[in-house]
């Protein structure tokens, strides 16, 4: 009861002057509030409140539900309280069966007692099941039993308040604990594809998946640098307790070029936020861009192999690819494949494998590719390097010695004279005439060179060498001379190939 200080307002006095009162069920509750400035009585139990403006609170036939805290308040706002237990053997507990707890916080199981003199006031699992080993609780007969630091694992735990009354264990109605999780991490967000490429008029649809411990996670699609609200559709699932998934699908039914940009899926909870982006590129029509992986002018030695390789971007997907040489289409020797297995891949590779090329196989090799919107092509000019071959070596009627050689690159013909029987021909002879015979012919064949010298310049027996050479190799042909009197005769010419 309050102590009175003279001159200061004091709290009211209550009769009976006790902090607690035990009344048997059916008996009278009579409480008197003594205060010159009496205002009201208030009764509270389990979040229920009743008021009475009379200074005497009378309940003629007390029931268990009259158990609770009775507070008298005066005009100064000062109050005094008495707690009344209405002992009812048939109703030991008052219960509010709704039981919710926040993870890591305490929660109150509302089962105040109607009899404070019972023993072993505690919690028990339903159907004799034990409570979780780590569950700690604190009983309070006037309020109920507080579960300390609620765990996620306690979700949907079924329990009773329990007490021993006259040697017998009594259970309350059952409670089902519902645990609200604490957000201990940001939401997990992912997107169906990181980038999209579309033609104007096509539908853009992208799905963001948000995963969290509760459906109380915020998510939205945003366009970067724009405040426009985007239209999205949701699907959601609970894959068990504390395992929530939402799919937020953004759709633009007919995409336009100016819809291109970066779209962000943003999600947040009380812990923090997370986001993921996808890029949309809308083109007015499809395209093909070809990138040669080797120089488009190719030089290759006779008998060697070469691979002609292109990479190309094609959108939409390529429909027809072919390699062509001299108006003929290759049916084999080439392969075409996507650069990656990624669903959004638009880059492809095509390779033509040319093996043991002959001098006659130089020319233009063309790669053609098309899709539903465009065609594109690229040409490779292939030159086959060949060692010179001496086609003719003759003494003409006008006394000229003529040597004709073919090869690629264009051969150079040098002449040498070897006096007597010497095999080494070191004295060079200047040609009278040099002509490239097929310079205006097909561009990729061997080049034919004709060179002539005047044999009248030779006064002694000996050998004349015609040497044709280029970057690949050299070949020689020989003319033997013998003088009979004043007559010069050409003995059979012969060739000597020098690699």
């Amino acid at each position: 009861q309050p102590s009175v200080s003279p001159g200061e307002p004091s709290p009211p006095s209550i009769h009976p002057a006790k902090s607690e009162l035990i009344v048997r069920v059916g008996n009278e509750i009579r409480l008197l509030c003594i205060d010159p400035g009496f205002v009201k009585w208030t009764f509270e139990i389990l979040d229920e409140t009743n008021e009475n403006k009379q200074n005497e609170w009378i309940t003629e036939k007390a029931e268990a539900t009259n158990t609770g805290k009775y507070t008298c308040t005066n005009k100064h706002g000062l109050s005094s309280s008495i707690y009344v237990f209405v002992r009812d053997p048939a109703k030991l507990f008052l219960v509010d069966r709704s039981l919710y707890g926040k993870e890591d916080n305490d929660t109150l199981v509302r089962c105040p007692l109607t009899d404070p003199e019972v023993t072993s006031y505690s919690l028990k699992g339903c159907q004799g099941k034990p409570l979780p080993k780590d569950l700690r609780f604190v009983p309070d007969p006037k309020a109920g039993i507080t579960i300390k630091s609620v765990k996620r694992a306690y979700h949907r735990l079924c329990l009773h308040c329990s007490a021993d009354q006259e040697g017998k264990s009594v259970l309350s109605d059952k409670f089902i604990l519902k645990v609200r999780p604490a957000f201990k991490a940001v939401p997990v967000v992912s997107v169906s594809k990181a980038s999209y490429l579309l033609r104007e008029g096509e539908e853009f649809t992208v799905t963001c998946t948000i995963k969290d411990v509760s459906s109380s996670v915020y998510s939205t699609w945003k366009r970067e640098n724009s405040q426009t609200k985007l239209q999205e559709k949701y699907n959601s699932w609970h894959h068990g307790d504390f395992n929530y998934e939402r799919q937020a699908t953004l759709t633009i039914s007919s995409a336009r070029v100016n819809d291109s940009g970066v779209f962000m899926c943003y999600a947040n909870n009380t812990f923090g936020s997370a986001n993921v982006t996808t890029t949309l590129e809308v083109v007015d029509k499809g395209f093909i861009n070809i990138f040669p992986m080797i120089n488009t002018t190719v030089f290759v030695n006779d008998g060697e192999n070469v691979d002609l390789i292109v990479e190309y971007e094609a959108f939409p997907k390529p429909e027809h690819q072919q390699w062509i040489y001299m108006n003929r289409t290759f049916t084999d020797k080439w392969e075409d494949y996507p650069k990656s297995e990624n669903e959004s891949n638009i880059r492809y590779v095509s390779e033509l494998h040319l093996t043991r090329l002959k001098g006659t196989e130089g020319g233009t090799y063309t790669f053609l590719v098309s899709n539903s919107d465009v065609n594109a092509s690229i040409a490779f000019n292939v030159y086959v390097n060949t060692k010179p071959e001496i086609l003719t070596y003759d003494r003409l009627v006008n006394g000229m010695l003529q040597c004709v050689a073919a090869g690629f690159p264009e051969p150079t013909i040098d002449w040498y004279f070897c006096p007597g029987t010497e095999q080494r021909c070191s004295a060079s002879v200047l040609p009278v005439d040099v002509q490239t015979l097929n310079a205006s012919g097909p561009p990729f064949g061997k080049l034919v060179v004709q060179s002539s010298i005047d044999s009248s310049a030779f006064k002694h027996n000996g050998t004349v060498e015609c040497k044709a050479y280029n970057d690949v190799g050299k070949t020689s042909a020989y003319f033997n001379f013998a003088f009979k009197g004043n007559n010069k005769e050409q003995i059979h010419p012969h060739t000597l190939f020098t690699p």
């Epitope: 979040d47 229920e48 709704s98 919710y100 707890g101 929660t107 509760s214 109380s216 996670v217 915020y218």
Partner: antibody, heavy 119, light 106 residues
């Protein structure tokens, strides 16, 4: 025991909005899930959306997305449902119920509020 | 959305009869299924939660079973106060209710 007390019946014109309240007496209101479920005359039950006041974020059924707003005031233990762009087919009894989010069952219902949409 | 199909849509029975109502989900909902009873002009009342758990205060003649996609509500011995409409409801995805089963007096 906890009760959910709803606001009174409403008559509205097509195109207008209606806001229905639901006051919880007692309990841990902030941790409840409060949902709104409607029932057109002679029809079945249709979930509109719900909120857990502690988290403050509402979830809506796809059908009502953009047309319904569910809010909660923890200080008064009251939840609200506002439905806009009303049409005649929105005539129904609107119930508030405890549960409906994060797999909670509806274990407590309000008495319902009749909303009539008529020109 | 997950569709909930209840059958039958209505049935006639007598006091004391055993009544069975079935509910089928269009995809698996584990055990996240609840049953409600509604009487004319009243709000629904929870009978069974989590497919088979009896709500406090509900008579033991009501029972529920099933998991995945197929569920059953059984009233072992129909009482006069049980004539009402019964709804199933799933809680895995956006909440959906079955179309209801009206239990009438034969």
């Amino acid at each position: 025991q906890v009760q959910l007390v709803q606001s009174g019946a409403e008559v509205k014109k097509p195109g207008s909005s209606v806001k229905v309240s639901c006051k919880a007496s007692g309990g841990t209101f902030s941790l409840y899930a409060i949902s709104w479920v409607r029932q057109a005359p002679g029809q079945g039950l249709e979930w509109m959306g719900g909120i857990i006041p502690h988290f403050g974020l509402a979830n809506y059924a796809q059908k009502f997305q953009g047309r319904v707003t569910i809010t909660a005031d923890e200080s008064t233990s009251t939840a609200y449902m506002e439905l806009s762009s009303l049409r005649s087919e929105d005539t129904a009894v609107y119930y508030c119920a405890r549960g409906g989010l994060d797999t909670d069952e509806f274990d407590l219902w309000g008495r319902g509020t009749l909303v009539t949409v008529s020109s | 959305d997950i569709q909930m199909t209840q059958s039958p849509s209505s049935l006639s029975a007598s006091v004391g009869d055993r009544v069975t109502i079935t509910c089928r989900a269009s995809q698996s909902i584990n055990s996240y299924l609840n049953w409600y009873q509604q009487k004319p002009g009243k709000a629904p009342k929870l009978l069974i939660y989590a497919a088979s758990s009896l709500q406090s205060g509900v008579p033991s003649r009501f029972s529920g079973s099933g998991s995945g996609t197929d569920f059953t509500l059984t009233i072992s011995s129909l009482q006069p106060e049980d004539f009402a409409t019964y709804y199933c409801q799933q809680g895995v995805s956006d909440i959906t209710f079955g179309g209801g089963t009206k239990v009438e007096i034969k």
